[in-house]
Interface confidence: medium
């Protein structure tokens, strides 16, 4: 025997108390699948969150963060304060990266400079709070008789990642 509620489309709920008729979702709620017995309440993008997509009767609202903050967690469940490049966010706010570390983004933590010597290379460009060191060719490559020197690949521009 077919469940009469299976005929209730997205955007409605099947009302047990009214002979299982399909009732539209109440205001500020949605059902993204058919046959539901209740509608989910819409997410509200309040405070530091702002609405990226409005709630409809069949889909939830989507939030992102106001300028100066960035999303964290699945579905932008949290907004975290941005810092400047060369800084990291601590419990006490944005702090400059310690010597020997860098951060080339407005989010995340300061990471240690690359240790060029571990790869048998030399430091071509010193690191800063905002940039990692650039490793050059190994000292052996620079010795007389070495065939050719391949120039180092340019450092990736900060703030850009594959879309």
């Amino acid at each position: 025997l077919q469940d009469p509620c299976s005929n209730c489309p997205a955007g409605t709920f099947c009302d047990n108390n009214r002979n299982q008729i399909c009732s539209p979702c109440p205001p500020n709620s949605f059902s993204s699948a058919g046959g539901q017995r209740t509608c989910d309440i819409c997410r509200q993008c309040k405070g530091v969150f702002r609405t990226r997509k409005e709630c409809s009767s069949t889909s939830n609202a989507e939030c992102d963060c106001t300028p100066g903050f960035h999303c964290l967690g699945a579905g932008c469940s949290m907004c975290e304060q941005d810092c400047k490049q060369g800084q990291e966010l601590t419990k006490k706010g944005c702090k400059d990266c310690c010597f020997g570390t860098f951060n080339d983004q407005k989010r995340g933590i300061c990471r240690p400079w690359t240790n060029c010597s571990l790869d048998g290379k030399s430091v071509l460009v010193n690191g800063t709070k905002e940039r990692d060191v650039v490793c050059g060719p190994s000292p052996a490559d620079l010795s007389p008789g070495a065939s050719s020197v391949t120039p180092p690949a340019p450092a990736r521009e900060p703030g850009h990642s594959p879309q």
Partner: antibody, heavy 117, light 107 residues
């Protein structure tokens, strides 16, 4: 037959965390919301939070930082976790099915949790 | 948060009486109000949803009314099994909140 049954530890030491399971039968968690409600001895009902058919949650603002509600649809179980318990968290904890325009049409019998050292 | 107030915490009535239990909200809740009955053993049942809709299986002697901030539950012909505590609950806005309850006793 629609049923909800809470199972909890009974006794919890202060500052410890509480985990309660609500096992449901006769319906699917993908179609109904489940709310948690508690009642301290001799006091009224207090709504703790809800988990929606799609898995989203909402919480009582006073307890939000200590509460977490999750579920396993395939096992027909909903879980309440509360951290940093104090003696005033001693209560009977109920799970209830939310349907229609968000009324609780079926309730579990409740499980009593005592916070004491 | 919306505060729900049941001013009468306990009420004594005789069998056959018509009993009214009131509930008020700290702001308008647009009829988004439910009523629950809790028996002395702790069992909780839904009586009325959306102010005045009778839940299936609930005797017709129970009825609900109200609008704006003021709501009431009426039991038209009190029976022994109605001895219980009655709670109103709003779902106009999250977090959902209950009234403090009204305990009904027999004279």
């Amino acid at each position: 037959q629609v049923q909800l049954k809470e199972s909890g530890p009974g006794l919890v030491a202060p500052s410890q965390s509480l985990s309660i399971t609500c096992t449901v039968s006769g319906f699917s968690l993908t179609s109904y919301a489940i709310s948690w409600v508690r009642q301290p001895p001799g006091k009224g009902l207090e709504w703790l939070g809800v988990i929606w058919p799609g898995g989203g949650t909402n919480y009582n603002s006073a307890l939000k930082s200590r509460l977490s509600i999750s579920k396993d649809n395939s096992k027909s179980q909903v879980f309440l976790k509360m951290n940093s318990l104090q003696t005033d968290d001693t209560a009977r904890y109920y799970c209830a099915r939310g349907t229609g325009t968000w009324y609780f049409d079926v309730w579990g019998a409740g499980t009593t949790v005592t916070v004491s050292s | 948060d919306i505060q729900m107030t049941q001013t009468t915490s306990s009420l004594s009535a005789s069998l056959g009486d018509r009993v009214t239990i009131s509930c008020s909200a700290s702001q308008g809740i647009s009829n988004y109000l439910n009523w629950y009955q809790q028996k002395p053993d702790g069992t909780v049942k839904l009586l009325i949803y959306y102010t005045s809709s009778l839940h299936s299986g609930v005797p017709s002697r129970f009825s609900g009314s109200g609008s704006g901030t003021d709501y009431s539950l009426t039991i038209s012909n009190l029976e022994p099994e109605d001895i219980a505590t009655y709670y109103c609950q709003q779902y106009s806005d999250l977090p959902w909140t209950f009234g403090g309850g009204t305990k009904l006793e027999i004279k």
